[in-house]
Interface confidence: medium
Amino acid sequence: EAYKSEIAHRYNDLGEEHFRGLVLVAFSQYLQQCPFEDHVKLAKEVTEFAKACAAEESGANCDKSLHTLFGDKLCTVASLRDKYGDMADCCEKQEPDRNECFLAHKDDNPGFPPLVAPEPDALCAAFQDNEQLFLGKYLYEIARRHPYFYAPELLYYAQQYKGVFAECCQAADKAACLGPKIEALREKVLLSSAKERFKCASLQKFGDRAFKAWSVARLSQRFPKADFAEISKVVTDLTKVHKECCHGDLLECADDRADLAKYMCENQDSISTKLKECCDKPVLEKSQCLAEVERDELPGDLPSLAADFVEDKEVCKNYQEAKDVFLGTFLYEYARRHPEYSVSLLLRLAKEYEATLEKCCATDDPPTCYAKVLDEFKPLVDEPQNLVKTNCELFEKLGEYGFQNALLVRYTKKAPQVSTPTLVEVSRKLGKVGTKCCKKPESERMSCAEDFLSVVLNRLCVLHEKTPVSERVTKCCSESLVNRRPCFSGLEVDETYVPKEFNAETFTFHADLCTLPEAEKQVKKQTALVELLKHKPKATDEQLKTVMGDFGAFVEKCCAAENKEGCFSEEGPKLVAAAQAALV
C-alpha cells in the first residue's frame, strides 16, 4: 500500500516515543563520532517534522522518501568533513547511492572507551532529573558503539534499563542493586549486538538465500508443530525485517517487526503452543518474548525422513523442478526432528544432500546412487559433537581464563598476522562458550556452542575485513558461511609466518596495572601472551605455561610491593630476559 507521506505513516504506526528513539538510534549508527547533543537536536527536528506531516500529509516535503529526508538531515551536520573525512563525499551523491555510501562508512570498531558507569547516586540523580534524556543517552552510547544493533531490540533494552533504575534508585543500597542488574543487561546487549551483526553479515555477504536457510532451520527447530508453509511465511517476513534494519531502514524494520509479532499471535494455533504468554505483552516485550520463546514439543507421529527424501521415486523430479523449495522442505523436516543440532550443522547436512542429488540425478540410476545419503551424514554430525566434547573437557579442566588462554595460543598460531587486540577480543569471546554452553545438558550443548562460535567468528571476519592481513582468514570468512567454524577449526599453525621483531616496550608494565578491574588485568596478560607468541611462534605449550606463570607471579609480587612502580621497572626487564631465554 502506497502512502502519501511515508514519514507520517511510520510516525502514526510507531507512536512518538518509539519514533524518536529509532531516529536517534539511526543517526547515532551513521554518525558515530557526533556528540549526543547534536543527535538529540537532529532527532527532535525530524520528529517534529514527522508530527507535522501526520497532521497534514500534503505538507511541504512530506512526500519525500525516508532516505531522502534522513540523508538531507545528516548532510546538514557542519562538522561532517572534519569528523568523518571522505564520508562527507556521500552528500554529493543522489539516493539510493547516498544511503549506500553512508552504510559503507559504518565503523564496526570505532574505538570508543568502554562505558564506565558513574557513581550510583549521580546516575540516579540524572535518571530522576530527566528520564527521557537519560534513556536517550543510553540509546546513543550503545548505537554508536554497535552500528548494526537491532534497533527495535535496543528500544526494548532501554526499557529494561529504565526498569532497573526505577527499581534500584529507590533501594537502600543503590550500588548493590544496580551492579549485578546492569552487568546482566550489559552481557545480553553485547550478545544481541553480535547476533545481529552475524545476521547482517549473512544477508550482506551471502544474500537472502543464506539468511532464509538459516532462519528456516532455526524456526523449524523452535516451532516443530508448524507446517512448512507457516515457517516459510514467517521466514519471508523475518528476512524483510532484518534486511531493513541491516540497511539502516530502522522505522520500516520496527514497524514490520511489530506486524510480524501481531501475525504470529493471531496465528499461534498453527505456529506453536508456547506463544500464549508472549502475546499478552505490549509490543516491544511481545516481539522480544517471541524471539526468545522456548521450543515447542515435537509432534509425536513424525514419519521417517527416508520416505520423502530417499525412497520416493520422484526425488529427482521434486529436486529438479523446484530446487529451493524441495531443499527448504528437507531442511525443515530435518531441523524439526533434530532440535539438538546446531543450525550450522543442519545447513551443512542440507548442503550435503543437495550435492548428492546434483550428482545422483545426473546418473542412470539415481535411487541407487542416493540410497545411502542419510548414512553419509554421520561424519558431518560427529565432527561438531567431538569438538564440543573435547573443548568442554578442556574448559572444565582449565576454567574460563585458562581456556581463553588456550584458545589465544591456538588462534595466534593459526593467524599470527591478525592484530593483537583482535586476537585477544575474539579469543576471550570464544572462551566464553565454555561458561555459556558446557554446563548445559548434552542435548543442548552442540546447538549452543557451535551457533555461538559462528557469531563470535563473524566478529573476527568483520574486523579482519576492515584491514585484511591474513589470506587464510579471508578464505575461511568468505568461502562458505556454514563452514566458517570448521574452516577455522581446521587451520593448522601458519608455517609461512615470519616472527615479529622483539620490542621491549610491548613487555613494559606499570603500577597502574594493579588498580585495574580483574577483566582488564586479564586482557593485559593475554595481550602479552599474544605478543610473546608473535615473537616466538614455535614456543611449546609447556614453555608458554611457565612464562605465563612467571608473569602472573611478577604482577602479584609488584602489586603487593611498597614501591610498586619501582618493582615493575626493576623486575620487568629481568622477567623479559628470563622469558626470552626460556623460549629459545
Epitope: 512448512f228 508453509a229 514419519p303 520423502d308 520416493d312 521434486n318 523442478e321 523449495v325 524441495f326 522442505t329
Partner: nanobody
Framework: EVQLLESGGGLVQPGGSLRLSCAAS????????VAWFRQAPGKEREFVAG????????YYADSVKGRFTISRDNSKNTLYLQMNSLRPEDTAVYYC???????????????????WGQGTLVTVSS
C-alpha cells in the same frame, strides 16, 4: 485442521468424462500438497494424481497418465480431477487428501497424508 469435501462422482459410460471437485477449508489449498487416491472394492487404496504445494508440480500414476488432469483454483480453494477416456477399471471411490506439513512433496504413500475427504463414488459401466 484441514477439512476436505469431494463432489462430482457418478455413473458414466466407458470413454466418457467426469470432473471431480474437492473443496478445502481451514487452510489455503496452494500451501499444501494435495492428491487424489482411489479405492476399488476389495483393493488397496492407490495414488492417482498429486500436485505440490507452493509450486505447481503435478504427478500421475502410470495408469492414468494422459487421461486425467489434476488442477486447483486457489481463489475457490478447490482441487479438481478432470477424468477423460474413462475405463471400467477406473471404477472406485475417489478420495481427496492433503498434506500441509511439507508443501511441494506429493507422496504416493497414503499413510503420509493426515487429512482426507469422505470420498465420492465413480462408476464406469455401460
Amino acid at each position: 485442521e484441514v477439512q476436505l469435501l469431494e463432489s462430482g462422482g457418478g455413473l458414466v459410460q466407458p470413454g466418457g468424462s467426469l470432473r471431480l471437485s474437492c473443496a478445502a477449508s481451514g487452510r489455503y489449498i496452494d500451501e499444501t500438497a494435495v492428491a487424489w487416491f482411489r479405492q476399488a472394492p476389495g483393493k488397496e487404496r492407490e495414488f492417482v494424481a498429486g500436485i505440490g504445494g507452493g509450486v505447481d508440480i503435478t504427478y500421475y500414476a502410470d495408469s492414468v497418465k494422459g487421461r486425467f488432469t489434476i488442477s486447483r483454483d486457489n481463489s475457490k480453494n478447490t482441487l479438481y480431477l478432470q477424468m477423460n477416456s474413462l475405463r471400467p477399471e477406473d471404477t472406485a471411490v475417489y478420495y481427496c487428501a492433503a498434506r500441509p506439513g511439507s508443501p511441494l512433496i506429493t507422496s504416493k504413500v497414503a499413510d503420509l497424508y493426515p487429512y482426507w475427504g469422505q470420498g465420492t463414488l465413480v462408476t464406469v459401466s455401460s
